[in-house]
């Protein structure tokens, strides 16, 4: 590296550092589609933002390749459970890549929150948090899925959310 | 940007990068006030530290504006529950800003942990973790609240904590 | 600092910034030893990687001193529980340092997941997530322990994992 080249790289790095990719997307009334697709998210209002990442149909889309800490929390709750006490919830972060036809599991949790309800009429609340570092290439996408999404409770964007930042 | 200006900015960035704001505060005997206020935290002893952030009456105070990953974990537990299976715990991170009179919800979880206590053995444990990226201006504060705080178990600073770092 | 010295530091920082230490280790069939030792992890296959950190017998080993956000998730589950409904699980991140003979607790969670199993359906799932910022010196190690590890469920590296990155 000559000093000029190094200088250019440093200038570029400083500028890119100013926009270290980060995003925080929040739950909204439209998040739960019931279509079997991923959860959808608010990207602009309230606490939601995108910086150096983009969004498409529920997915955070990577612009700059690198290692990202990705995270999601979902607020679960209900009055009783659709499958009774045996109901299991799977909450996961999945990657979509142009190089592979199917979604790839990245981070996944399974919970049985309904054991907290003791009868059909019992109100219960639970929460699932996931976070971890994964490598993402430009153009790859990350989505959140919850099965059974009927048990996800949305309110004001503070209880269910999805985000990422480059590390 | 002239090269001299860029140089100064780079030097400044290098120096500020050395103190990328971060903090980790730990639970202590004095954390639970019972006054309806936020939880209080240890800032110096053991694993606790402040770097580029300050602390005031339970709050992490932002010195440098930017996007921060903020997090908190609380250890919950008890022998039975004050409201039985109906007992709900709300654990949240809230923002205080000079521009608005009321605290703003940032990240919140609700749990019904008391279903974990069973017929004879009334002892139960649960944990709540929150983390997410939010934008904070200089002078803004973040606090942790737990309702019902009677269900928070403190011991040695490893089970209940509160932290942040700039992303 | 003369400009040459500053220049060298900036060049060095740029290069080291390219390898900001980070790692994500995943659960594997060999993770649970039953020996009373820490959990073991996959470091290369699938989603697992090491960048600027090394690995030894279950431990992430720090090469470069600094503040690290460390995290772990474990997937818990079972059919009934070995100690009945009163079973408690402790999931923790612990530090090993050459300066002290015993492991130091960093971040710990206790849960009573078996209250989620009920009389008729004894199958249950639960998850425990830990994350927080700690200071680590070069040569220090971080490990994950779960007591009772019989309740940890491994599958494909997405449900139980361990990672860190410098902040």
């Amino acid at each position: 590296d000559g000093p000029a080249g190094s200088w250019e790289q440093l200038i570029q790095e400083r500028r890119s550092h100013e926009v270290n990719p980060a995003a925080h997307l929040t739950g909204a009334n439209s998040s739960l589609t019931g279509s079997g697709g991923p959860l959808l998210w608010e990207t602009q209002l309230g606490l939601a933002f995108l910086r150096g990442l983009s969004y498409h149909d529920g997915a955070l889309v990577v612009t700059k390749a690198g290692y990202y800490y990705i995270y999601s929390k979902v607020q679960l709750g209900g009055v009783g459970c659709p499958l009774g006490l045996a109901s299991t919830i799977t909450h996961g972060l999945y990657k979509r890549t142009p190089r592979y036809p199917e979604e790839l599991e990245l981070l996944v949790s399974q919970q049985s929150p309904c054991g907290r309800a003791t009868s059909s009429s019992r109100v219960w609340w639970d929460s699932s948090f996931l976070g971890g570092v994964v490598h993402l290439e430009a153009g790859e996408e990350v989505v959140v899925r919850v099965l059974d999404e009927r048990l996800v409770r949305l309110r004001d964007g503070t209880r269910s959310y999805f985000g990422a930042f480059m590390v | 940007d002239g090269p001299a200006g860029s140089w100064e900015q780079l030097i400044q960035e290098r120096r500020s990068h050395e103190v990328n704001p971060a903090a980790h505060l730990t639970g202590a005997n004095s954390s639970l006030t019972g006054s309806g206020g936020p939880l209080l935290w240890e800032t110096q002893l053991g694993l606790a530290f402040l770097r580029g952030l300050s602390y005031h009456d339970g709050a992490l105070v932002v010195t440098k504006a930017g996007y921060y990953y903020i997090y908190s974990k609380v250890q919950l537990g008890g022998v039975g529950c004050p409201l039985g299976l109906a007992s709900t715990i709300t654990h949240g991170l809230y923002k205080r800003t000079p521009r608005y009179p009321e605290e703003l919800e940032l990240l919140v979880s609700q749990q019904s942990p008391c279903g974990r206590a069973t017929s004879s053995s009334r002892v139960w444990w649960d944990s709540s973790f929150l983390g997410g990226v939010v934008h904070l201006e200089a002078g803004e504060e973040v606090v942790v609240r737990v309702l019902d705080e009677r269900l928070v178990r403190l011991r040695d600073g490893t089970r209940s904590y509160f932290g942040a770092f700039m992303v | 600092d003369g400009p040459a010295g500053s220049w060298e530091q900036l060049i060095q920082e740029r290069r080291s910034h390219e390898v900001n230490p980070a790692a994500h280790l995943t659960g594997a069939n060999s993770s649970l030893t039953g020996s009373g030792g820490p959990l073991l992890w996959e470091t290369q296959l699938g989603l697992a990687f090491l960048r600027g950190l090394s690995y030894h017998d279950g431990a992430l080993v720090v090469t470069k001193a600094g503040y690290y956000y460390i995290y772990s998730k474990v997937q818990l589950g079972g059919v009934g529980c070995p100690l009945g409904l009163a079973s408690t699980i402790t999931h923790g991140l612990y530090k090993r340092t050459p300066r002290y003979p015993e492991e130091l607790e960093l971040l710990v969670s206790q849960q009573s997941p078996c209250g989620r199993a009920t009389s008729s359906s004894r199958v249950w799932w639960d998850s425990s997530f830990l994350g927080g910022v700690v200071h680590l010196e070069a040569g220090e190690e971080v490990v994950v322990r779960v007591l009772d590890e019989r309740l940890v469920r491994l599958r494909d590296g997405t449900r139980s994992y361990f990672g860190a990155f410098m902040v």
């Epitope: - | 022998v79 409201l83 039985g84 109906a86 004879s120 009334r122 009677r150 011991r155 | -």
Partner: antibody, heavy 119, light 111 residues
């Protein structure tokens, strides 16, 4: 001030049922557990179980399961204890005891209701 | 169930003297560094009165001459200087596990 006022003494025949009331005042009724404890002549105190007024959820001492029933009327801040299939050894003073703020002790008690079971 | 055993069954002490009452549980009543043990006083014709909760915490309105100590399975109630109104029956009670159980009582009488 906190007060728990119980119904008056009862005399019952073996096999009958008795229903004792406990009316609470001076605090937020649904925020505290209510326990039932009895004391038989020459015996010690015996915990019968608890009710959570907020939900009506109950926990019974196995010894009284199937015979004791606790209910709540939130509109009048009253809890009830009904004991069926009475026998002579059920002769006792029955107390309601409020769960304390930290809920695992009983900080206020009713004055007691004497139930006599005799043929 | 957890069996609570109090001793002595009867304790005769003079006013102004110290009284020490013991209670043993058949298994530990501790959880997370806290003991789920309470002490009550009962006088004839009256309901029980909470004196000490969580082994050593003095209930509001109870005179400071009453104190509690112990952990695990062994507990003590101490009355530092007996007053005439302290002569009564004292019960220990565990609340770690259902059913809650009481000791058989210690009768404190005037010597």
């Amino acid at each position: 001030q906190v007060q728990l006022v119980q119904s008056g003494a009862e005399v019952k025949k073996p096999g009958a049922s008795v229903k004792v009331s406990c009316k609470a005042s001076g605090y937020t009724f649904i925020d505290h557990i209510m326990n039932w404890v009895r004391k038989a002549p020459g015996q010690g105190l015996e915990w019968m179980g608890r009710i959570y007024p907020v939900s009506g959820e109950t926990n019974y001492n196995q010894k009284f399961m199937g015979r004791a029933t606790f209910t709540v009327d939130r509109s009048t801040s009253t809890v009830y204890m009904e004991l069926s299939s009475l026998r002579s050894e059920d002769t006792a003073v029955y107390y309601c005891g409020r769960g304390s703020y930290y809920w695992n002790a009983m900080d206020y008690w009713g004055q007691g209701t004497l139930v006599t079971v005799s043929s | 169930e957890i069996v609570m055993t109090q001793s002595p069954a009867t304790l005769s002490v003079s006013p102004g003297e110290r009284a020490t009452l013991s209670c043993k549980a058949s298994q530990s009543v501790d959880f997370d560094g806290e003991s789920y043990m309470n002490w009550y006083q009962q006088k004839p014709g009256q309901p029980p009165r909470l004196l000490i909760y969580s082994a050593s915490n003095l209930e509001s309105g109870i005179p400071a001459r009453f104190s509690g100590s112990g952990s695990g399975t062994e507990f003590t109630l101490t009355i530092s200087s007996l007053q005439s109104e302290d002569f009564a029956v004292y019960y220990c009670q565990q609340s770690i596990e259902d059913p809650w159980t009481f000791g058989q009582g210690t009768k404190l009488e005037i010597k």
